[in-house]
């Protein structure tokens, strides 16, 4: 049994880091493998992650972490029984994938304005709470070409757009994702999408 593709890990910079790797053949990850991880920290102890299958030869492990700070460094040991298959390290602050925003809501009761709001996925005491920026994706269910991205570079988790920038009388969907420039993170996954019917009063034409 050998590792074909070494583990790569990303951290949500809160409580979970996810490591993925590939074996050289079909593997029952949960029965055959164990990933041991230990904070490089005086008197810390190793924790064991039981991996799950992620395709025939792929494995994934969710490492539980008690908070994350920038200095954290973990040693990783991948074991098959008594055989050490791979040894490495992982610094969560250098491999951050933020959590996806939640509770995306479209408020259509504001006069001719769409107000989109969502929740910051981090608690106020987490470093990323004040460092997230967002991308909002809005698209038409009827017209695949009607697809737009709004970059929200301020901290408030909201976006206002004129309803008239979208077509009236059709349904739209929106979703939002996050990233943090401070840690050069990857983008989060998209939030679940929300749907609304766009309608607004066309302005009277002046003749």
């Amino acid at each position: 049994m050998k590792v074909l593709q070494e583990p790569t890990c990303v951290s949500d910079y809160m409580s979970i880091s996810t490591c993925e790797w590939k074996m050289n053949g079909p593997t029952n990850c949960s029965t055959e493998l164990r990933l041991l991880y230990q904070l490089v920290f005086l008197l810390s102890e190793a924790h064991t992650c039981i991996p799950e299958n992620n395709g025939g030869a792929g494995c994934v492990c969710h490492l539980l972490m008690d908070d994350v700070v920038s200095a954290d460094n973990y040693t990783l040991d991948l074991w098959a029984g008594q055989q050490l298959l791979w040894k490495g390290s992982f610094k969560p602050s250098e491999h951050v994938k933020p959590r996806a925003p939640g509770n995306l809501t479209v408020h259509t009761n504001v006069s001719d304005t769409l107000l989109l709001t969502w929740s910051n996925p981090y608690p106020p005491d987490n470093y990323l709470y004040n460092h997230l920026t967002y991308a909002v994706n809005i698209w038409s269910e009827n017209d695949p070409a009607d697809f737009r991205i709004y970059n929200v570079t301020y901290l408030e988790p909201s976006l206002r757009i004129a309803a008239s920038t979208l077509k009236s009388g059709i349904s739209y969907r929106a979703r939002v994702r996050a990233w943090a420039q401070c840690y050069n993170t990857t983008w989060s996954e998209w939030s679940p999408s929300t749907k609304w019917h766009n309608s607004y009063r066309e302005p009277f034409e002046q003749h």
């Epitope: 904070l39 920290f41 005086l42 810390s44 102890e45 700070v69 200095a71 954290d72 460094n73």
Partner: antibody, heavy 120, light 108 residues
């Protein structure tokens, strides 16, 4: 209420031994690494020793290595420091301290301290 | 072994002023953790800051920590009468724990 209560301090002659105890209440000792820190009269804080939550690993400052032994009894929620070959420079207030991994070495709960005096 | 000199040894200020206390590690500490403690006469130390910049539970927001590498700072934005005490920095690493010698913050 989360508390640490040290006991076992006293006056001992150079070369003698003492065993300090620390009783924890208000939390489960087995979830935390535990440490001893001392403070000589009028001086600063000095790290002495620590033990991981399951006793799998221990650590000693160079100044006490080979003379002090740290141990714990998790079911009894108690931490110990066995001190032998005591010297005058071991005279200090000894604090029992809890470290939360979440606090990354920050010692968030301290006992009130027990005084050890080494003198002839 | 890492040494943690603190400066100044004594700092004389008045209530309402800003206090800046320094802690300088003798070598870089990228995978270690810096904490700050406050100690008043006859009392055990109290944790103020951990992980260089995070306030411990119940610590007022006038206390803040910053720094990286070898230079670390504890700032008290506006001194209250109860803030006059001795302050210690502490480095908790992968192989050792070290305390600074302390800075005494006294009323001017």
């Amino acid at each position: 209420e989360v508390q640490l209560l040290e006991s076992g301090g006293g006056l001992v002659q150079p070369g003698g031994s003492l065993r300090l105890s620390c009783a924890a209440s208000g939390f489960t000792l087995s979830s935390y690494a535990m440490h001893w820190v001392r403070q000589a009269p009028g001086k600063g804080l000095e790290y002495v020793s620590g033990i991981s939550y399951s006793s799998a690993s221990t650590y000693y400052a160079n100044s006490v290595k080979g003379r002090f032994t740290i141990s714990r009894d998790n079911p009894k929620n108690t931490l110990f420091l066995q001190m032998s070959s005591l010297r005058a420079e071991d005279t200090a207030v000894y604090y029992c301290v809890r470290v939360k991994v979440r606090y990354r070495g920050g010692m968030d709960v301290w006992g009130q301290g027990t005084t050890v005096t080494v003198s002839s | 072994e890492i040494v943690l000199p603190q400066s100044p040894g004594t700092l004389s200020l008045s209530p309402g002023e800003r206090a800046t206390l320094s802690c300088r590690a003798s070598q870089g500490v990228s995978s270690a953790y810096l904490a700050w403690y406050q100690q008043k006469p006859g009392q055990a130390p109290r944790l103020l800051i951990y992980g260089t910049s995070r306030r411990a539970t119940g610590i007022p927001d006038r206390f803040s920590g910053s720094g990286s590498g070898t230079d670390f700072t504890l700032t008290i934005s506006r001194l209250e009468p109860e803030d006059f005490a001795v302050y210690y920095c502490q480095l908790y690493g992968s192989t050792s724990v070290t305390f600074g010698q302390g800075t005494k913050l006294e009323i001017k």
